[in-house]
Interface confidence: medium
């Protein structure tokens, strides 16, 4: 069974998938469609790297631009370095500016909804 066929079989169960499962899927050439990606738990999507999302979505990564204002894409963008987002070649904006340090302060983030940044 190839990645696409496997994805079809598990698609209906993915809504509650944890980050670890999504990372594993990104290595299996599944080409997750955007409709499914948009239904994933935001907290599961946030830790994914730009490279992992690109692998997870396959051709559908090109559709991220259309969803950049919607959750979970919007929140995921806020967590990525702008340099990394730029490598997607989609013009996504809103990432962490170059030279900033990201502090993973869970309480701060829980209160504000955004990561805490220290300037250069």
């Amino acid at each position: 069974m190839n990645g696409s066929e496997y994805f079809v079989k598990i698609q209906s169960f993915l809504g509650g998938a944890p980050t670890e499962d999504l990372k594993a899927l990104s290595q299996q050439n599944v080409s997750m469609d955007l409709a499914t990606f948009m239904k994933l738990r935001t907290d599961a999507v946030l830790p994914l790297t730009v490279a992992e999302v690109q692998k997870l979505l396959g051709p559908h990564v090109e559709g991220l631009k259309a969803e950049e204002r919607h959750r979970p894409v919007r929140d995921w963008i806020l967590r990525q370095r702008q340099d990394d987002l730029d490598t997607l070649g989609l013009g996504l904006q809103g990432g962490i500016p170059n030279g900033y340090l990201v502090l993973d302060l869970s309480m701060q983030e829980a209160l504000s909804g955004t990561p805490c940044l220290l300037g250069p």
Epitope: S4, V8, S31, G58, A66, D86, T87, G89, L90, G91
Partner: antibody, heavy 120, light 107 residues
Framework: EVQLVQSGAEVKKPGASVKVSCKAS????????MHWVRQAPGQRLEWMGN????????NYNEKFKNRVTITVDKSASTAYMELSSLRSEDTAVYYC?????????????WGQGTLVTVSS | DIVMTQSPDSLAVSLGERATINCKAS??????IAWYQQKPGQSPKALIY???YRYSGVPDRFSGSGSGTDFTLTISSLQAEDVAVYYC?????????FGGGTKVEIK
């Protein structure tokens, strides 16, 4: 208005290489991946590969992987498709087409096509 | 690779009548399908995306339906300018693939 202007027709001998250009205007070149599709006489359309204009990363159809190279010149908003080791069955019209422009998937805009004739 | 099989290969329909073109994918592609119209000597023109949504400027006599593996393009009332070859395309996974085309003519 989105415009894709391709280079002119080419006649090549078997074993030679051809490089076709596609100059884009009317949109942000680095925000949309450029794809190349070819059509041999009386045949179906055939996807060759694409390129991420931001960093030059590419995906290729396995059928062409060892013979095709897709590149970009960001400063000139131009994409290139080079096909090597030409054979008679490579005689076709070659098209460039960005995907997902205006947030809709599919190839909504196409270049005018470049006829490449391979003949001894 | 996902193989897209179109039927029929050609279709002759009277002006004002309905034309129906089928496209079958070799595996589930969801609704990640587009349809194109190509006239002789011209680049393809996009008609439908996501299986059933018309691109702006496409007449509403063109409609698409289906999901999974079976898709249909319908021209509800054939006009002279609709004479062309029609292609389906999947963008669900790499490599992107096209159907073999259906030639629509006037009876």
């Amino acid at each position: 208005e989105v415009q894709l202007v391709q280079s002119g027709a080419e006649v090549k001998k078997p074993g030679a290489s051809v490089k076709v250009s596609c100059k884009a205007s009317g949109y942000t070149f680095t925000s949309y991946w450029m794809h190349w599709v070819r059509q041999a006489p009386g045949q179906r359309l055939e996807w060759m590969g694409n390129v991420n204009p931001s960093n030059g990363g590419s995906n290729y159809n396995e059928k062409f992987k060892n013979r095709v190279t897709i590149t970009v010149d960001k400063s000139a908003s131009t994409a290139y498709m080079e096909l090597s080791s030409l054979r008679s069955e490579d005689t076709a019209v070659y098209y460039c087409a960005p995907h997902y422009i205006g947030s809709r998937p599919g190839f909504a805009y196409w270049g005018q096509g470049t006829l490449v004739t391979v003949s001894s | 690779d996902i193989v897209m099989t179109q039927s029929p290969d050609s279709l002759a329909v009277s002006l004002g009548e309905r034309a129906t073109i089928n496209c079958k994918a070799s595996q589930n592609v969801g609704t990640n399908i587009a349809w194109y119209q190509q006239k002789p000597g011209q680049s393809p023109k996009a008609l439908i995306y996501s299986a059933s949504y018309r691109y702006s400027g496409v007449p509403d006599r063109f409609s698409g339906s289906g999901s999974g593996t079976d898709f249909t393009l319908t021209i509800s009332s054939l006009q002279a300018e609709d004479v062309a070859v029609y292609y389906c395309q999947q963008y669900n996974s790499y490599p992107l693939t096209f159907g073999g085309g259906t030639k629509v003519e006037i009876k």
